[in-house]
Structure formats: structure tokens, C-alpha cells
């Protein structure tokens, strides 16, 4: 890093002072400072001397010495104040150009650091700064307007308080240029349009930019449309709007419409599709199967997609039976709009009860008529089992009734000892009944089956168990013969609560 002699960060000198600044480095060194008169520069090898025999206020500034060959790019600096009571300001530039949201440095350098406490920034002719102008001051560099705005493009003066009066610098013109971040921003409304032949339609294409220099046009199937343009300026943006009004649409108006805007940064375009139909339409569909099976106690959401034009005049969910005459609670019905012509309607059925199985219908109406979509909801139940001892045709028979949905399968077990449930170690015999007799099988109800086990002689120290299972679960009933007759044991798990 080069070294400046004298080795102080800043100095205050009199006008007319002789100033010699010497910079020494390992290699060749270079001076950089404000453009000002009277300086002479001479170098010898690794040192460079900046000298004046008659310093003026214009020599006020920061003098930086760099070593071009230094890979670390180190530098040293000294700030010189030439304290001139008649000239409190040294203005290094009378025009400053920045882009919006950059910091704008107005380079009026104070010639006497003592004056720092009384400095201010004003607009020319003593006008105050615009509201929300956020600025700071450095005696070495001047005033910085932070995050400059286009509207702050003004002529400014730096003011210093000297002996009770304000002394102004020459004016500095600030030009804040709008940043054009890219092509203009676009909106094309509506994003989709459907009309019946003969109806009116409107398509609006608008573009905006921070700069006025941009073009916008609307095209239909690659044909540019001649539409008068409306221009406006608000929120610090220029806007250009093209409005296509169609009094009576016909099929030739249908197709793709593109809104295109361009400036020096490039081009943006956005498209929409206009559909012209002969008459009103209303289509109902669902991504779900219309036949639903759900385990009792669980929940289900039924969803219907609606495509319609014109908009719906009415819609509702209806329970068509077969159990109670209850209707779905409105709070469980929900409607969401995907876009202008497509909607999703959801019916939430939480913790389903046996009486809620059946048909659910979504009905919708628009000028095109009524449409309905019906779901069939069947509830699944684990089997419930009961066993009785009876005589059929004079033969002793164990009769097992199992009821559930889907239809239960039945298995008989004979095991040693008296038990509520046969375990593997106790099992003596197993009989599967592949075709139990179906006693009842109505839609939306449980299926009840019956299985018969003919037993010639009941073994008294044994247990006969009927087991039923389906995809939901299983149930069983243990039959224990006793000398005085038969005794049955339903297991604990039979006590099922949905």
C-alpha cells in the first residue's frame, strides 16, 4: 500500500498556501484527485509529488494515491481543505446524472470543516427540498440524495452558514433517469372470454412503463388490429390502453388475441382465447368415480366441476335417500371459482353415519337449462356375528349370522377347552364356508349372510367359533356347549361403535 507524506488524513490550509504531497510506493504510483488548477506533478521511480505554490479553494478535495501494479489494489488518501472565507464551497461538477433508486452525490466540497454543522441542501432560488428527500452530508464528498427519484431531477445549491448568513454554492443540476428494467408490463383482460353469437364483448390490452417510449398493439390470429390508443400517466408510469369493443360477436371474432408491447429493452406479449358459441352451455363432471365406497365413521369430499356460460343462476346439493329425509348442511358445501367459466363445488361429509349412505346429487342451472350429477355412496362396515344352536330336519345345527359390507366370508373353528376365542394352539378343526347363504342385500345397506354347521354330537369340553371377515375388519362369536344346554359368548370386540 502506498504512503502519503505528510501522513495525516486531512489538512486545512490558507488560500495561497504552498502544498507538496509526496506519495511513495513499492512500484510506480499515481495520483488521483479533483480536477483543479495550479497543481504540478513530477515523478521519480517509486515516488510521485503533487505540488502547488498557490492553493485556492478549488484545490479542496481528496487526493488519492494508488499503486497500479499492486494486485491488492491498495491506496492512500489525504483530504485538503483550502479555507477561503469568501468561498465555502468547491463544486466539482455542475451536472450529476444517475438512474432512479441510485444514490446521487452532489459534489460540493466544504472548504472549511468547521462549517459542517451549518450546512444544508436547497433547491435553487431558496426553494425547499421536495418532501421525502432523504439526504446526508460528508465534508469530503458533498451531499448524497439517497435513492433518488425521477421527480427529484432539479437544480440544487449547497448552503453553508457563515457569520449568521447563508452562503450558497453554484448550482448543481441533478438528472435522475428512469430505469427501464425491461419491456413494458402488460395486462390483457379478460384472460379468457366466451360469448353467445350476437352478444357484446370487450377486450382490453394495456401496457405500462416508466418511460414513455414504447409501442403497444393488439392482434387477432396474427392480424394487427387498428384500435385508437388511450394514454395516461399515474403512479409514476406511462400507460397505453387499447380497447376492442364488439357490439355483436360472430364466429369470425373467435380465436387467439395477443397483446404485444415493445421498447428498447425488448418485447413482451400475452394472449387470451375468445370462444363464440351458438347457445348457452352447462357441463358437469367429476374427476372422482360416481360410485363411492367409504368406511363408516370416515369422511368424504364430493367434488363437481362445472363449465358454464352464461354464469350459474342456481345450484345445490341434494340427498336423494334412501335413509332419512335429511339434506346436506349448507355450511358443508363449498364453491371455488377456477376462472370465469369454470367452477368447483365441494360437499364435505365428515365422520359418515349409517343414515348418510345413499345418493347425493349436485344440481346446477343457467339459461341453458338444468343439469345434475349424482354420486352413489355406500358405507363399508366390519362384520357383526351371532351364533345360535338349533335343530334343522332333526339334526343339531350351529347357525351363524354375519352382517357387514362388503359381503363377509365365514369360517368355522372347533377348538379344545372353553374359550372366548380360539387360538392356534387350541384349534382342532377349521371349516371355510365358501358360499354362505345371503339373507339380505339391498343397495346402501349391510349384506347379511348365514352359515350352517351341522354337528352330530356337541363335545362338551370344546368351543365352536364362527368367524366372519371382509376388507374392513372381522368379527366372531364363540359357542360353548354345556350340559344344561348351549352357551354363547360374543367377544368384546363385537361391541362396535362407529
Amino acid at each position: 500500500i502506498p504512503v502519503i507524506e505528510p501522513s495525516v488524513p486531512e489538512l486545512v490550509v490558507k488560500p495561497g498556501a504552498t502544498v507538496t504531497l509526496r506519495c511513495v510506493g513499492n512500484g510506480s504510483v499515481e495520483w488521483d484527485g479533483p480536477p483543479s488548477p495550479h497543481w504540478t506533478l513530477y515523478s521519480d521511480g517509486s515516488s510521485s509529488i503533487l505540488s502547488t505554490n498557490n492553493a485556492t479553494f478549488q484545490n479542496t478535495g481528496t487526493y488519492r494515491c494508488t499503486e497500479p501494479g499492486d494486485p491488492l489494489g491498495g491506496s492512500a488518501a489525504i483530504h485538503l481543505y483550502v479555507k477561503d472565507p469568501a468561498r465555502p464551497w468547491n463544486v466539482l461538477a455542475q451536472e450529476v446524472v444517475v438512474f432512479e433508486d441510485q444514490d446521487a452525490l452532489l459534489p460540493c466540497l466544504l472548504t472549511d470543516p468547521v462549517l459542517e454543522a451549518g450546512v444544508s441542501l436547497v433547491r435553487v432560488r431558496g426553494r425547499p427540498l421536495m418532501r421525502h428527500t432523504n439526504y446526508s452530508f460528508s465534508p469530503w464528498h458533498g451531499f448524497t440524495i439517497h435513492r433518488a427519484k425521477f421527480i427529484q431531477s432539479q437544480d440544487y445549491q449547497c448552503s453553508a452558514l457563515m457569520g449568521g448568513r447563508k452562503v450558497m454554492s453554484i448550482s448543481i443540476r441533478l438528472k435522475v433517469q428512469k430505469v427501464i428494467p425491461g419491456p413494458p408490463a402488460l395486462t390483457l383482460v379478460p384472460a379468457e372470454l366466451v360469448r353467445i353469437r350476437g352478444e357484446a364483448a370487450q377486450i382490453v390490452c394495456s401496457a405500462s412503463s416508466v418511460d414513455v417510449n414504447f409501442d403497444v398493439f393488439l392482434q387477432h390470429n396474427n392480424t394487427k388490429l387498428a384500435i385508437p390508443q388511450q394514454s395516461d400517466f399515474h403512479n409514476n408510469r406511462y400507460q397505453k390502453v387499447l380497447t376492442l369493443n364488439l357490439d355483436q360477436v360472430d364466429f369470425q371474432h373467435a380465436g387467439n388475441y395477443s397483446c404485444v408491447a415493445s421498447n428498447v429493452q425488448g418485447k413482451h406479449s400475452t394472449s387470451m382465447f375468445f370462444r363464440v358459441v351458438e347457445s348457452a352451455y352447462l357441463n358437469l363432471s367429476s374427476e372422482q368415480n360416481l360410485i363411492q365406497e367409504v368406511t363408516v365413521g370416515e369422511g368424504l369430499n364430493l367434488k363437481v366441476m362445472v363449465e358454464a356460460y352464461p354464469g350459474l343462476q342456481g345450484f345445490n346439493w341434494t340427498y336423494l335417500g334412501p335413509f332419512s329425509d335429511h339434506q346436506p348442511e349448507p355450511k358443508l358445501a363449498n364453491a371455488t371459482t377456477k376462472d370465469t367459466y369454470r367452477h368447483t363445488f365441494t360437499l364435505s361429509l365428515p365422520r359418515l353415519k349409517p343414515s348418510e349412505a345413499g345418493r347425493y346429487s349436485f344440481l346446477a342451472r343457467n339459461p341453458g337449462g338444468w343439469r345434475a350429477l349424482t354420486f352413489e355412496l355406500t358405507l363399508r362396515y366390519p362384520p357383526e356375528v351371532s351364533v345360535i344352536w338349533t335343530f334343522i330336519n332333526g339334526s343339531g345345527t350351529l347357525l351363524c349370522a354375519a352382517s357387514g359390507y362388503p359381503q363377509p366370508n365365514v369360517t368355522w373353528l372347533q377348538c379344545s377347552g372353553h374359550t372366548d376365542r380360539c387360538d392356534e394352539a387350541q384349534v382342532l378343526q377349521v371349516w371355510d364356508d365358501p358360499y354362505p347363504e345371503v339373507l339380505s342385500q339391498e343397495p346402501f345397506h349391510k349384506v347379511t349372510v348365514q352359515s350352517l354347521l351341522t354337528v352330530e354330537t356337541l363335545e362338551h369340553n370344546q368351543t365352536y367359533e364362527c368367524r366372519a371377515h371382509n376388507s374392513v375388519g372381522s368379527g366372531s362369536w364363540a359357542f360353548i356347549p354345556i350340559s344344561a344346554g348351549a352357551h354363547t359368548h360374543p367377544p368384546d370386540e363385537f361391541l362396535f361403535t362407529p
Epitope: E5, P6, V8, P9, E10, L11, V12, V13, K14, G16, A17, T18, V19, T20, L21, R22, I49, Y81, K83, P113, V114, L115, E116, A117
Partner: antibody, heavy 125, light 106 residues
Amino acid sequence: QVQLQESGPGLVKPSETLSLTCTVTGGSISSYYWSWIRQPAGKGLEWIGRIYTSGSTNYNPSLKSRVTMSVDTSKNHFSLKLSSVTAADTAVYYCAREILVVVAATRTGGVFDIWGQGTMVTVSS
Amino acid sequence: DIQMTQSPSTLSASVGDRVTITCRASQSISSWLAWYQRKPGKAPKLLIYKASTLESGVPSRFSGSGSGTEFTLTISSLQPDDFATYYCQQFNSYWTFGQGTKVEIK
């Protein structure tokens, strides 16, 4: 408007250390050199020494062994200590701001554009 | 040390007079000389620096000249406010002052 004000005891015993402080008001102490100058009764002005805001100092060779100067930028003041005083150190002591007229690699020199009112220090037992 | 010698030590003059004070340096000090005015009970006031440059706010009746070892302060037309003691000061090598010249009313 920058003003300087000297403060310190008006009476110091021989062989003791004279301590004075100069307070700067109306502006920052930064960027300048600050000097102490004295004038014994019936004699001329004598420059004692100077200090820059960074703390670097230059002293009058004839007083160098006895002089210590310091600066406190946070309090905006600078100080003088003169040790082993004798009756010959009896004088009016001024603090002054120096503004440079010559700046060179090896030295800087200037004139005193702002002075304090001065404070009388008597060395006596 | 560079010695500074002022002459005369005392100067009697009347309002309107042209007054000249001389200052000699024991060795060459180029143009590194200043002149101060001091009134009783007040701090010295800078008049001229770099031998001939008038300090801001100082009346133009004051002027300075010289280089090397011989320097002069001239008051072209003495005013009542000018009766005071004047000091020269060199800043070529450290800082030394002349012993002062008192300008009094004749």
C-alpha cells in the same frame, strides 16, 4: 464561530507540573493543528508546541524534555503538561488554532488564526 | 533556532500617518512570515501571512512585503483602531516571534 478557552490552575509550585486544557467550541477539533504559545511578562511570544487531532506532536526543542501534549476529540479539547516548572515558566499561556500555509512531505507550517484569551500561570512557592 | 528581530520597539505616530515596521530573520525564511496585531487584554489577531497575503476581513491599508530575511509591515494611513502592538512570526522552521513593536499615539 470557533472559540478557544484555556483553563487550569493559576498558581503552580516550583518543580511541579503545570497542566492546562484548551476547550474548542463552535466547531470540531478535527482536521487542524492546535498549538500552545506563552508570553512571560515583558518578553516576546514563545511557541511551546503543537498537536494534530490524530495525536502526533511537535515541540519547541528548548522545552521538548518537559512538554507533553494530548488531545481528546470526543471532548473537543487538547491539553498541555509542563513538568519541573521554575519561576521562568511564569507567563500568560495561550492556545491557538494553526492553519497551514506550507505543506511538505517532511513538515507543515502555518499561522495562528484563532487564539484563546490567555490564562496567567504563576510559578511560586 | 531562527531569531526574529523587530524594529523599532516603539513607534509614535498620528492618525493618518504612514507607518512601517521592519522584521529581520537570522536566516532565510523564504516567504514564511506572518504579522499579528495585539491590543491589551486581547488575543493576537492575524493580519498577513506568506509575507504579503492579506488575511480575510483585514482592511486593505495593511500590507506586507519582503522575502528571505528582510520583511516590512506597512499601514498606509494609520487609524485610531490601529494603535496596538505588532508581532512578526516565522514558520519556516518551527515557530518564533519577534519581540513586538508598539505603535502609540504621538
